[in-house]
C-alpha cells in the first residue's frame, strides 16, 4: 500500500480508565498531513464521533474509558502530499487493583510509571497525563500505599509531586489521581507509579543551563498580559526541579489567592545529548507592584531572573 512502517510502540494500560495516544512523529507530522487511526489492520477507520467510547480526536486516539477487550495493535496512518507513514501501537490492557496488597508490585509497566527519587535531595515525581485538548483535567491528588499524601515535605505543583529531602521511606507504590471531563462526562484517571530510591547523582555532577532568561529586564506596559518562557538545557537523566519563584516562593503559591501570575505546564524536547525544557510564567495583568521584582526561574542549582520595567516614555 506504499506506506512506510515506522515503529512499534508497546503500552501497558489499566482497564476502566481513560487513555489517549497521540500520533506524532516529527518532522513528519509537523507539515500538512492527515492522520487516520485503525484497529488491528481493519480497513475501517476509528470513529471520529466524540460520543463514541473509542474515537479519533484530531491526531489522538481516545478511549473513554479503556476496556479489557481493547487490547490489540492500532495503526495510525500519516499521509502527506507525497508520503505515507504508519505507526503501530501495541496496547495491552491489564486489570490492577492498586490497593490489593496481595498483588506484589505492578505488571511490566512502561518507564513513566517507574520513577526514581534521589536520597537526600529535593526531587519530584511526575503524573504523566497525555490527553487531547478536549479533555479537561482537574486537580491531581497523590497517594502512597493507598493513603493520600500529606506533610510539609510534599508539594503538588502542576503535574508534579515535589518531595524535599528524599528519605529511604519515600520508596514504594504511589498513585496520582485526577478527574478528567470530556463532553460533560467525568472519568477517573489513576496512574500507579513504582518509586525506587538511589544515592547516585542523577546528572553526573553537571548543572542545568538556563538559556533564557539571562538576568535581564523586559519592558512591558502596565495592564498588559505577558508570557515569558524559561528555557533550560539539562542532561537526559536529570532529576532537577524546574519552576518560577518570586520572593523565594513558588509563584503559584505566592499568587494563590488572585491567580494573576501562574506557572505554565512544563514541556520538553529531547535531543541526542540533552533535553531542552520550557516552563513559562503568565502575567494575566501586569500591575505596578510587579515592576522591579526579580521573577526567578530555577532549575536545580541554577537560577536566572527577569525583571519587568515600564517602557521609556516616548517624547516624540
Amino acid at each position: 500500500d506504499g506506506c512506510n512502517d515506522i515503529f512499534m510502540k508497546n503500552e501497558m494500560l489499566s482497564a476502566s480508565q481513560p487513555f489517549a495516544f497521540n500520533c506524532t512523529f516529527p518532522p513528519i507530522t509537523s507539515g500538512e498531513v492527515s492522520v487516520t487511526w485503525y484497529k488491528n489492520s481493519s480497513k475501517i477507520p476509528v470513529s471520529k464521533i466524540i460520543q463514541s467510547r473509542i474515537h479519533q480526536d484530531e491526531t489522538w486516539i481516545l478511549f473513554l474509558p479503556m476496556e479489557w477487550g481493547d487490547s490489540g495493535v492500532y495503526q495510525c496512518v500519516i499521509k502527506g502530499r507525497d508520503s505515507c507513514h504508519r505507526i503501530h501501537v501495541n496496547l495491552t490492557v491489564f486489570e490492577k487493583q492498586w490497593c490489593d496488597t496481595s498483588v506484589k508490585g505492578l505488571p511490566n509497566l512502561s518507564d513513566e510509571y517507574k520513577q526514581i527519587l534521589h536520597l537526600g535531595k529535593d526531587d519530584s515525581l511526575t503524573c504523566h497525563l497525555h490527553f487531547p485538548k478536549s479533555c479537561i483535567l482537574g486537580p491531581i491528588k497523590w497517594y502512597k500505599d493507598c493513603n493520600e499524601i500529606t506533610g510539609e515535605r510534599f508539594t503538588v505543583l502542576e503535574t508534579r509531586l515535589l518531595v524535599s529531602n528524599v528519605s529511604a521511606e519515600d520508596r514504594g507504590n504511589y498513585a496520582c489521581q485526577v478527574i478528567l471531563t470530556h463532553s460533560g462526562k467525568q472519568y477517573e484517571v489513576l496512574n500507579g507509579i513504582t518509586v525506587s530510591i538511589t544515592e547516585r547523582a542523577g546528572y553526573g555532577g553537571s548543572v542545568p543551563k538556563i538559556i533564557y532568561p539571562k538576568n535581564n529586564s523586559i519592558e512591558v506596559q502596565l495592564g498588559t498580559t505577558l508570557i515569558v518562557d524559561c528555557n533550560i538545557t539539562d542532561t537526559k537523566d536529570n532529576t532537577n526541579l524546574r519552576c518560577w519563584r518570586v520572593n523565594n516562593t513558588l509563584v503559584d503559591d505566592y499568587y494563590n489567592e488572585s491567580k494573576r501570575i501562574r506557572e505554565g505546564v512544563e514541556t520538553h524536547a529531547s535531543f541526542r545529548e540533552y533535553n531542552l525544557y520550557t516552563v513559562n510564567i503568565t502575567f494575566l495583568e501586569v500591575k505596578m507592584e510587579d515592576y522591579g521584582l526579580p521573577f526567578m526561574c530555577h532549575a536545580g542549582v541554577s537560577a536566572a531572573y527577569i525583571m519587568l520595567q515600564l517602557p521609556a516614555p516616548d517624547f516624540r
Partner: antibody
C-alpha cells in the same frame, strides 16, 4: 524474575580491547541502573561503572580513559568495552542491577560472571 | 575517593561464635551495603540500607552503623556463613567496595 547473562571472549591479548555483553531478561534496561563490576583473582571487588535508564554513563575514574559502557534497548543488552588491556585487567567480570525493595543501589541481581584472561 | 577499610581482613571462627565485621569509611556515607561471596560464585546482596536483610538472609545476621563506621554481625555462626563479605557505599562516586573479610572455619 530478572536474569543477567554475561558473554564475550575469555582470552584477550594485551593492548587489545576487552568486549563483553550483558543480556537482560525479566526487566527493561530503560528502567534503573545497569552496572559492571569485576573481581580480580584473589582480590576484592572493583566497581567499573553503569549505564542508567536514560543512557547516561558513569565510569570509575581509575578506568575512565579506557572504559565505554553502551546499550542496545531493542535487544535489551548492555555492553562493556575496556581498551588497552594489560594483565592487571584479568578478572571475573559481572553485570549486575539493583531495584530490590525499591532500592536501586541494592545490587540484588547478578550475572554468573565471566572470567577474562589477558595474555599473549 | 572514599576509602573503605574492612577489619579484620580474615577471621577464623567456630560454629556458634558471635562475629563482628567492621567497615570504616574515610568520609561519611549515608548507607552501607553488604555482599556475601563464596568461591566461584557471584556476590549476593546480604544487607542493604545499612540494616535491612535481603531476601533469604537468616535473622542471625544484622547490620548497623552510621557516618564512617558500620558493622555486620552474626549472632551465632553457622557452617554456611563461611564466605567473604564485602561492604560498599553509593554515597559518593567512585562507588567503592571494601577489600573484603574472609571468614574461615577455625
Amino acid at each position: 524474575q530478572v536474569q543477567l547473562q554475561e558473554s564475550g571472549p575469555g582470552l584477550v591479548k594485551p593492548s587489545q580491547t576487552l568486549s563483553l555483553t550483558c543480556t537482560v531478561s525479566g526487566a527493561s534496561i530503560t528502567s534503573g541502573y545497569w552496572n559492571w563490576i569485576r573481581n580480580h583473582p584473589g582480590k576484592g571487588l572493583e566497581y567499573i561503572g553503569y549505564i542508567s535508564y536514560s543512557g547516561y554513563t558513569y565510569y570509575n575514574p581509575s578506568l575512565k580513559s579506557r572504559v565505554t559502557i553502551s546499550r542496545d534497548t531493542s535487544k535489551n543488552q548492555y555492553y562493556l568495552k575496556l581498551s588497552s588491556v594489560t594483565a592487571a585487567d584479568t578478572a571475573v567480570y559481572y553485570c549486575a542491577t539493583g531495584g530490590y525493595d525499591y532500592v536501586e543501589d541494592a545490587l540484588y541481581y547478578w550475572g554468573q560472571g565471566t572470567l577474562v584472561t589477558v595474555s599473549s | 575517593d572514599i576509602q573503605m577499610t574492612q577489619s579484620p581482613s580474615s577471621l577464623s571462627a567456630s560454629v556458634g561464635d558471635r562475629v563482628t565485621i567492621t567497615c570504616r569509611a574515610s568520609s561519611n556515607v549515608r548507607y552501607m551495603y553488604w555482599y556475601q561471596q563464596k568461591p566461584g560464585k557471584a556476590p549476593k546482596l546480604w544487607i542493604y540500607l545499612t540494616s535491612n536483610l535481603a531476601s533469604g538472609v537468616p535473622s542471625r545476621f544484622s547490620g548497623s552503623g552510621s557516618g564512617t563506621s558500620y558493622t555486620l554481625t552474626i549472632s551465632s555462626l553457622q557452617p554456611e556463613d563461611f564466605a567473604t563479605y564485602y561492604c560498599q557505599q553509593f554515597t559518593t562516586s567512585p562507588y567503592t567496595f571494601g577489600q573484603g573479610t574472609k571468614l574461615e572455619i577455625k
